[in-house]
């Protein structure tokens, strides 16, 4: 069967700051088996936005529920945006292990984050 | 294209602080890593240290106390700041950019500087 | 750190002969997502480095086409299919897997 891969199909997403951000992340296979995480950046240097498996992560939500076994959307809400959230951000499978580990990463979608309206 | 040009005087006393800048033109300095790397009189390259855009640091270990990498958005520059130099640290320095888009690691230092070359000396 | 060894540390070459330079790291570059974190640069005479290969195997943009990596864990391999003039300088591989960031050695190509 073929290889799981990440899509994100929005290359780039443009919010005015004080509203939410919707970043779009599906997969195409349910193999492997292992969470998703999403972070802004990559490199050595990436920060962690969103860990479906464990941690706090206030502004986010998951858009669909992303705990069900059959899930495949990955998409989450980013809320009250601010200039300092623009930047690319890469939805990334990880393999089930001990520890997870990093299995394939999405293209990216960079977030802009305008004025807010007056 | 992105342009790079490293600045900065090119003759440093012994135990003084070397000083040196790289203004980026034609691009964002956003979503890269921007890089320092020296090349010794007749020797291989050595990664002194790159700041990633959100403004963390990574340094070569062998260097760490001694250098610090900072970064200005507004100006589009990044600089290098080092420490206590002596006839070691003379060389050519250059500023470079590393990109980053598939994982942890990263993906070539795609552009760099001309290379400004720093004699340290009494 | 991981340590990176090129050879050969000199390597002369005829025009329009293939050349090949050898790269191994103490440690392995390839990471869980499949990519071997490994590049390899060009110093021509005088000028700076250019990439030339990156994430092991794939070229840099404008590179041409002789040029080629291949190899991955710890051992990696540049080859020239038919090396040219402009081809004459010192290549360096460098593992960007991990920081420090370090480069192999270098190896000198020159014309026979």
């Known amino acids: 069967e073929e290889e799981l891969q990440v899509i994100q199909p929005d290359k780039s997403v443009s919010v005015a700051a004080g509203e939410s951000a919707i970043l779009h992340c599906t997969v195409t296979s349910l193999i492997p088996v292992g969470p998703i995480q999403w972070f802004r950046g990559a490199g050595p240097a990436r920060e962690l936005i969103y860990n479906q498996k464990e941690g706090h992560f206030p502004r986010v939500t998951t858009v669909s529920e992303s705990t069900k076994r059959e899930n495949m959307d990955f998409s989450i809400s980013i809320s009250n945006i601010t200039p300092a959230d623009a930047g690319t951000y890469y939805c990334v499978k990880f393999r089930k292990g001990s520890p997870d580990t990093e299995f394939k990463s999405g293209a990216g979608t960079e977030l802009s984050v305008r004025a807010k309206p007056s | 294209q992105v342009q790079l040009q490293e600045s900065g005087p090119g003759l440093v006393r012994p135990s003084e602080t070397l000083s040196l800048t790289c203004t980026v033109s034609?691009?964002?300095?956003?979503?890269?890593?921007w890089s320092w790397i020296r090349q010794p009189p007749g020797k291989g390259l050595e990664w002194i240290g790159f700041i990633y855009y959100n403004g963390r640091t990574f340094y070569n270990s062998s260097l760490k106390s001694r250098v610090t990498i900072s970064l200005d958005m507004s100006m589009n520059q990044f600089s290098l700041k080092m420490t206590s130099v002596t006839a070691a640290d003379t060389a050519v320095y250059y500023c470079a950019r590393v990109r980053a888009y598939s994982g942890i690691g990263l993906d070539g230092t795609d552009v760099w500087g001309q290379g400004t070359t720093v004699t340290v000396s009494s | 750190d991981i340590v990176m060894t090129q050879s050969p540390l000199s390597l002369p070459v005829t025009p329009g002969e293939p050349a090949s330079i050898s790269c191994k790291s103490s440690?392995?570059?390839?990471?869980?997502?499949?990519?071997?974190?490994l590049d390899w640069y060009l110093q021509r005479p005088g000028q700076s480095p250019q990439l030339l290969i990156y994430?092991?195997?794939n070229r840099a943009s404008g590179v041409p086409d002789r040029f080629s990596g291949s190899g991955s864990g710890t051992d990696f391999t540049l080859k020239i299919s038919r090396v040219e003039a402009e081809d004459v300088g010192v290549f360096y591989c460098m593992q960007a897997l991990q920081t420090p960031l370090t480069f192999g050695g270098g190896t000198k190509v020159e014309i026979k």
């Open positions: 034609g691009g964002s300095i956003r979503n890269y890593y």
């Open positions: 440690q392995s570059l390839l990471y869980s997502n499949g990519y071997n974190y």
């Open positions: 994430l092991g195997s």
